[in-house]
């Protein structure tokens, strides 16, 4: 922390302005009232601070508000927002989208992963829902950021933003993400054809259930490989031979080459030996021919 | 080592058709699938489509739906692709190529379409 | 369908020298939950079939000498052969295995001074 000295009557300061490059830490901190460089906290970004100086500024306005800083602050944070923990952010009320662009330009190219997601956190819970407007400041100036919300939080989406979503946007989504996000999609392309159905639908069938997937294959789709790899393994695995190859269509050759990834490997595992051999691929590691397959959970709820 | 042997010509007039042939040799025939290819001079390389010859399917590429017509026979390693209502368009070399990334290829059919 | 674009079309080097052809893809070919990408590099030397050099973008096919060498992922590609030889002389095919129908570039002649 910063030693408390008394501010030299040359030295004080009436506006935030270029001068105070020049002035040393302690001298900032005596002499650059809190108030005054909350009220002028716009013009602080144009100025060429350095990193300890913004130290400085940061430890005047953690003390003038302890419970977090208010909105018009925060706007105009700059560069001030790379000083900034999740642990401050978290103690903000953001309800602005040009905030959140704002601070989103600031931290590109920076490693703020952590605090980007816990301001998006902020900003819907200051909206009080993760609306349309929300979901196009975020895809346009964060992609991939979506996927750093909590389900809890995606569950505030409503399925008629879903079609502002791109599959870029979901790239780092995690399961239970997908399983917020598959039903409310879901319910938004309901209307649609078939092929177009699938078209929008594939980005969230990382959160598809087993009775979903089982329907697809029924409706020529040619699932890509790397999307059948992102469905739940318990959405695969109770899958036939006959339903991952409809579902796959020329794609199934790929199995050969993941063969040792799941979803693949352990879907493998359960196929009879002569079924896989109708695939073609030389696949092997299934149930041999004659093997009868006891299923011990069944007995053991019964009992 | 492993081969995928194909003839040299084939000379046909247009309206006719033709069946090329791929014989396999020196691996499992029944554990890769066979893919064929067209390569007309100066223009690249098109995938007409595929076939499983553990159970037949077949898949083609739309552009060649109506025009290529891809078989096997197990029992002698060799697949076929039947080309009809031909044009001086279907003029080409065509090649067999096997597996997920294409890692032998056959030593490719010129067919040439002239009255 | 997926387009794959080559460049340069077609390039002329001396033996010894490094040559370096690029491939972009429409879509990412990248399989995130294998991390493959689904791209093959192949040689067609004059009058001869097509063969392949690398598949996966970077894994090498056996028998194929180690100055050839694949790099990229999900949509910009690279070849590389670090010190060409005459035996080169060739075209280089990039082809995408993601998703049907299967698709290739329009290929980069190398010729060798």
């Known amino acids: 922390d910063v030693e408390r000295t008394t501010c030299p009557p040359e030295k004080e300061v009436h506006e935030i302005d270029e001068s105070l490059i020049f002035y040393k830490k302690r001298e900032l901190e005596a002499c650059v009232d809190a108030a005054l460089l909350a009220a002028q906290m716009d013009r602080v970004d144009a100025i060429p601070f350095t990193y300890e100086q913004l130290d400085v500024l940061k430890h005047k306005l953690d003390e003038l508000y302890p419970q977090g800083y208010p909105e018009s602050v925060i706007r105009h944070l700059g560069h001030l927002f790379l000083k900034m923990s999740p642990e401050d952010i978290r103690k903000w009320n953001v309800t602005s989208l040009e905030t959140l662009k704002a601070l989103l330009k600031v931290s590109k190219g920076h490693e703020m992963s952590a605090q980007v997601a816990t301001l998006i956190d902020r900003v819907v819970v200051g909206r009080g829902q993760l609306d349309k407007d929300t979901v196009d400041t975020l895809t346009a100036f964060c992609p991939g950021c979506l996927c750093s919300l909590s389900p809890e939080r995606l569950s505030s989406v409503p399925p008629s933003v879903i079609g502002a979503v791109r599959p870029q946007d979901l790239d780092t989504c995690g399961p239970r993400q997908l399983d917020v996000l598959y039903p409310k999609a879901r319910l938004a392309f309901q209307n649609m054809s078939g092929s177009e159905y699938f078209v929008k639908i594939r980005p969230f069938l990382g959160g598809a259930p087993t009775e979903d997937v089982k329907a697809l294959s029924q409706q020529n789709v040619s699932m890509d490989l790397a999307t059948f790899m992102k469905l739940r393994r318990e959405a695969v695995l109770p899958l036939t031979v006959a339903e991952v190859q409809k579902l796959l269509g020329p794609h199934v050759e790929g199995l050969k080459v993941e063969e040792q990834h799941s979803p693949v490997r352990d879907w493998i595992l359960k196929q009879r030996q002569d079924d896989l051999d109708t695939l073609g691929l030389g696949l092997q590691g299934g149930i041999p021919n004659g093997y009868l397959i006891l299923d011990l959970s069944v007995r053991e709820a019964l009992s | 080592q492993v081969q995928l042997q194909q003839p040299g010509t084939e000379l046909v007039k247009p309206g006719a058709s033709v069946k090329l042939s791929c014989k396999a040799s020196?691996?499992?025939?029944?554990?890769?699938?066979m893919h064929w290819v067209k390569q007309r001079p100066g223009q690249g390389l098109e995938w007409i489509g595929s076939?499983?010859?553990?159970?037949?399917?077949?898949y083609y590429n739309e552009k060649f739906k109506n025009k290529a017509t891809l078989t096997v026979d197990k029992s002698s390693s060799t697949a076929y692709m039947q080309l009809s209502s031909l044009t001086s368009d279907d003029s080409a070399v065509y090649y067999c190529?096997?597996?997920?990334?294409?890692?032998?290829w056959g030593t490719g059919t010129t067919v040439t379409v002239s009255s | 369908d997926i387009v794959m674009t080559q460049s340069p079309s077609s390039l002329t080097v001396s033996v010894g020298q490094k040559v370096t052809m690029s491939c972009k893809s429409s879509?990412?070919?990248?399989?995130?939950?294998?991390?493959?990408?689904?791209l093959a590099w192949y040689q067609q030397k004059p009058g001869q079939s097509p063969k392949l050099l690398v598949y996966?973008?970077?894994t090498r096919e056996s028998g194929v000498p180690d100055r050839f060498i694949g790099s990229g992922s999900g949509t910009d590609f690279t070849l590389i052969i670090s010190s060409v030889q005459a035996e080169d002389l060739a075209d280089y095919f990039c082809?995408?295995?993601?998703?049907?129908?299967?698709?290739f570039g329009g290929g980069t002649k190398l010729e060798i001074i």
């Open positions: 190529a096997r597996g997920w990334y294409f890692d032998v």
């Open positions: 020196d691996y499992t025939f029944t554990s890769y699938w």
């Open positions: 076939i499983n010859p553990s159970n037949g399917d077949t």
């Open positions: 879509q990412s070919l990248l399989n995130s939950s294998s991390q493959k990408n689904y």
């Open positions: 996966f973008a970077s």
């Open positions: 082809q995408q295995h993601y998703s049907t129908p299967r698709t």
